[in-house]
Each structure stands twice: as C-alpha cells, then as structure tokens.
Amino acid sequence: QSPIFGPQDVSSIEGNSVSITCYYPDTSVNRHTRKYWCRQGANGYCATLISSNGYLSKEYSGRASLINFPENSTFVINIAHLTQEDTGSYKCGLGTTNRGLFFDVSLEVSQVPEFPNDTHVYTKDIGRTVTIECRFKEGNAHSKKSLCKKRGEACEVVIDSTEYVDPSYKDRAILFMKGTSRDIFYVNISHLIPSDAGLYVCQAGEGPSADKNNADLQVLEPEPELLYKDLRSSVTFECDLGREVANDAKYLCRKNKETCDVIINTLGKRDPAFEGRILLTPRDDNGRFSVLITGLRKEDAGHYQCGAHSSGLPQEGWPVQAWQLFVNEESTIPNSRSVVKGVTGGSVAIVCPYNPKESSSLKYWCHWEADENGRCPVLVGTQALVQEGYEGRLALFDQPGSGAYTVILNQLTTQDSGFYWCLTDGDSRWRTTIELQVAEATKKPDLEVTPQNATAVIGETFTISCHYPCKFYSQEKYWCKWSNDGCHILPSHDEGARQSSVSCDQSSQIVSMTLNPVKKEDEGWYWCGVKEGQVYGETTAIYVAVEERTRGSPHINPTDANARAKDAPEEEAMESSVREDENKANLDPRLFADEREIQNAGDQAQENRASGNAGSAGGQSGSSK
C-alpha cells in the first residue's frame, strides 16, 4: 500500500475548480523532493501535468498550481476552469520520476445537470433568498395555491394560500402575488440552508385541472477562494455579502473543526491574537467590507469565513464567503523585531523593511488604534507632514536601496505604547507591525543636552553640548535640525563659515553644536543622536528658542518647550513657527486607493511641496572631524 494519501474520487462540474491535497510521510527527503501530478494514459505511462520543479504542461497553462507545504507534509494541486476533458485517472506523487511514491486519484467532471423542459432551475448561495415563480391558468385564479417539496414519492407542503407554513420554513417562506397579475404567484424562501435544496412543485387548484410547475433549487455552499501569502506579509479579505445584509453586523471568523471563531466583528469583538494587526473597513453602503491582517504568522493559515448577522456571530442560513489562507514560510520579507522597548524620556529607532525593488515608493508609519473596527492614522511619511502632537519628536529616515527605512520617536511617554505599522504605497504585502512598549525610566537617559534652558540670541554665537556615555564612543555622533519633513543632519564645521557646525571633545565625551551667527530661522527642535552607518540609535531632543538682542522675552518659553521634551510631550501644545498650511499633508492617493482604513495624515493638498529626504542633508555627515 502506498504511503501517499489523498482523495480517491473527486467529482465536480464544468467551470468549477478543484483543490486536491496529497499527504506524504513526514521525512526530510520527502519534504524536499520533487512533487508531481500526472495523468495516467492507456499505455501505462503517466504524463506530468505540473510539478514542484516548475514544470507546467500546455493544457494546464494559466489554470493550475502545485504548492508544497512541508510543515504539514502535504502538497496541494489546484485546477481551475474544469472541462469534461479533465475527466480521467491521475496520480499525485513524490520522486524524481513518475514511478516513485504515488496515490491514484480519479477525477470526474460532469456537465451542468439538465432537467426536464418544464423544470425551472434556481441556483442560490447559502443564506440568500430565492423567488420561485408559479404560473397558472385563469380557471385556477381563485383556487388554493401551494408549494410542496418532493421527498421520494411524496410532496410535503411548504406553504399554501391558507396561510399554512411548514415549521422548518417558518419566518422564511411567503406566498404572494404581484400587482394585478392573474396568472402567476410567487414563493420567496429566505435564509437558504443546504437542506432546502431539492425539487419543488408549485400548484394552483386541485385534481386533474390543477396547474403544476416544477422547480429545482440548488443551494451552493461557499467555494473557498485560495489565498497564498508569505510569512510576515499581509492579507486582505474582501467580503461582498449583498445589499440585503447591508444593515446587519459583519464578522470575519476562522473555522475550527466544530464551528467558526469570530476574529473581528463590527460590534467591537476582536480576537486578542490579532490585536494590533487587524482592521475591518466598510467599503460602501451595500454590505461590502474588507478585513486586513498584517504580520502574518504560521498559525494564521486556515479557513476563514466572512458573514453578516445582527448578533455579529455566524448563523446558519445567512450569507457567507469563504477563503483558505496558506502561509508560506519561505518568505521574502525579512524577520524584524515585533516588539520594541523604550523608556519614558528616551527614544526608539524602528527599522521598517520594504520591497528593495521599490526604493522610490513613499514610506509611511501609522499608529494602530483599537477603537471601533481598528484604524491606523498616518503619523509620518516621506511626503506626509508629521502629525500634530509629534512635532519635534518623530522623523522618518529613508535609506534608498537598503530595503529599509528608520522611524525615530523620542521624548517617549507611556502613552506612546501600542501598535504601529510600517507601510509603503508600493507592494502591500510589505506591511509590518511593531508593538512599542514604553516603561517608566529608572535611570538618567544615555544622552543629555546642556544647557537645557536653550535660548539663543540673534547675531551671537550659540553652542549646545550633548553628553554621551563611553559605550557610544565608537559610534557616529550627529546633530540634526528637526523639521516637518525629517531631521536634516547638520554639516560638519568646515562646510561653511555661516552654517551650523559640529565638533567633538572625545576626552569628555561631548558632541557640540554651534550656531554662528544665530538667525531667526535657527529656532526649532534639534536632535542629538548616535548611529552606526545606516543603523540609527539613541536620540534626544532640545528646543532652541531664538530671541532679539533688544527684547527680553523669547519667542517661546524655552523652559516649557524642553520640559515637554523631558516629561509630558502629549500634554502641551507647542506654538509652532511653521506656517499653518504646512501642517496639512496630502498622501499619494495610490497608497490607500481602496484601503480607507489607514487614515490620511491630512486633508489638504500642499502646493510646491518638496519630497522629504529626512536624514540626508545633501549626503553630508554629521560626525565630528
């Protein structure tokens, strides 16, 4: 007997798809050897149709796939657009030749069934409504009307015009006539279930003069759509259940052997396993919605179903849509940290991978919010201004060609804890989820700036120092000036007499920034940071206020500004010198063309906006000389 196992008989109808799973013994050799699907000929030869080596025959071109799942010791052959010519004997097997280990599979593809001329065929999906049309002659206009269901030789009444309704059709079947029609009546059966399928007879009148019509009702269970996604990538379930359930609660559930466990619904239920990485978005007023899951894990593979019911839970007789999700562990998406830890007052540098082939794509960072069905408002992007409340403490550093960009958030508070998403306007699979955990600081920060009360006077020289511990000795130190489109690293002191300069006293582990002479436009947030090549590390921020020599009061109270930097950045609204219209951003509409769940960072187009090139002031280094 063969150690390979699969379905011995597969039957379907023309136009359908089949998905044939073959099981093999769990050995290293089996996991890695060639898998094949071949058709048995009369001469005993088995002609390969598709194999895991990449071979695909002409007759399967564009309609078949073979996917190996070594972690399950299975491989799956998917064949679409079946025709009667596909009927035959096949083998699924393992080995370098088609004579190795195999299992015989018989595939039978039938024509769509035909019925006698007087039979009307109704094909409906589970949960939908069917309207059966029953014609009669004028002589039976005032006679009793009925619909019965054939069970063997008997025909059991479902509903009649005397208001009788079979208990199993209670609240689901109605018999009615439309307008002034005198020769036709209708029966509606709603919330169809599989057992409703069968042959129905509608009748007007009694005895030999009765008018009868045959109706064959086929109730289709959902054919799962197959989705193949990489580990750590994202998947979107697009659910279109129809207008009749537009006002009912929607859900996505994951099937187990007994039932279907709700992952998310529009009544606020959400499975903790998907916290921070799921969004449910209504698409329109016709019952369409989508569910996006990011950061796919091996255990996310399985059967999913979306549906609608006032309870937000799966119910028999309500419309559903089904998917089977496969998660490929050989992923192109690199493994990145899923949890990043920080302390209050400190900073985090989060590395976001993206498809290296799309280095010119726009990069974004959003904050996942649990309210309602989940949403993710964009906080920063390569062409999106930093959101209010994050000024001076958030920047995105693009590193073209590296396949990653870095987001730095400093002046951390415990309220920054939560889930964040890295995303681009390119390959939607490359969405990563990071959980940021901010704990109360128990020691002084690694980087400290003096003076903390930073007020510079126009026309004078102003120096500010950043103290760093010895552990950062070998790392590059830099100062950058924060602006709404990034933090531009300041050139070294020999870049020009007027420009800001950086110098470093190694013996006392200090990196200093000098503004000489101070100008009004020098006012703003400055960051001191460390990095190693493209890898960014700790940062700290300070607000430098600029005042006139003649005026006693600075533009902004520097004590308040830097208290915010150290203590409570979420509490204090900072007066900004940036023009009001620069606080609006307009994201590229391609980014979320059909995914409105990720909120736009602004709503007003900004004219003549230069693209943000955070962290690259003309490629100049901020390190000391």
């Epitope: 196992f5 379905p7 011995q8 008989d9 597969v10 039957s11 379907s12 109808i13 359908n16 798809s17 089949v18 998905s19 044939i20 099981y23 589970i126 599989p194 086929q218 289709l220 269970e221 959902p222 054919e223 799962p224 099937k255 187990n256 052997k257 007994e258 039932t259 279907c260 399985g302 059967h303 799966p314 119910q315 028999e316």
Partner: nanobody
C-alpha cells in the same frame, strides 16, 4: 450542536452487502465533511471513508482495506451520508461510527472530527 444518528447495521453473511446511513440534525453551522470510522473489539478506532464537499465539488477518501468494496455518498437535501458496503468480510465486523467536522485537516485523523454518533454494530459471519 450537531447530532449524528447512525442506522443500517446488522448481521450479514460474508459476501453480502449493507448500507449504513448517518443523519445529521441540529446543525447551527454548515459541516463540510462527514465520514465513517470503525472499531473492532479490542482494537483502536480506525478510518474507513470520508466525503468532503465544497460547493458542487466532492472529494471521497477511503482506507486501503475498503477500496473498491465500500462507497461513500451524501444526500444534501436530507443531511445524510451513506456508506454502501459490498463484498463484506468477517474482518469488517465492528461498530461503525459516523463523524462530522466543519474543517477537514487530515481525513484519517480522529481528532479532525468534532462530532460523533453513538455507532451501529455490523457483524459479518462466515
């Protein structure tokens, strides 16, 4: 909760046929696979046959020892699955159990099935 009721068991001669039925009721969620397992005295319960459906496509799985002799089928309208057993042998004597699941992983695995019937006795005398 799904209830499964088996019927059709009995005492037959070797070489005879029997048809087992399994009726499902009380279902609140569609099942997608129903199958038959058997347990002979002093032995472990073993897989016999399973039928899985997806839309208008059906997949039938059989254990090696019944291939060509047993046929599994279903009547969608009646929520019933049948096991037609031909050319019965004395070694087919066992209690036959019906099982159902909404999600089929490996059809041969007992733990893939959520619901079980009480069983029906099949005795084949020589």
């Amino acid at each position: 909760e799904v209830q499964l009721v088996e019927s059709g068991g009995g005492l037959v001669q070797a070489g005879d046929s029997l048809r087992l039925s399994c009726a499902a009721s009380g279902r609140t969620f569609p099942t997608y696979a129903m199958g038959w397992f058997r347990q002979a005295p002093g032995k472990e319960r073993e897989f016999v046959a399973t039928i899985r459906w997806s839309g208008s496509t059906q997949y039938k799985y059989y254990a090696d020892f019944v291939k060509g002799r047993f046929t599994i089928s279903r009547d969608n309208a009646k929520n019933t699955v049948y096991l037609q057993m031909d050319s019965l042998k004395p070694e087919d004597t066992a209690v036959y159990y019906c099982a159902a699941t909404t999600l089929l992983t490996d059809p041969r695995a007992l733990n893939a099935y959520a619901y079980w019937g009480q069983g029906t006795q099949v005795t084949v005398s020589s």
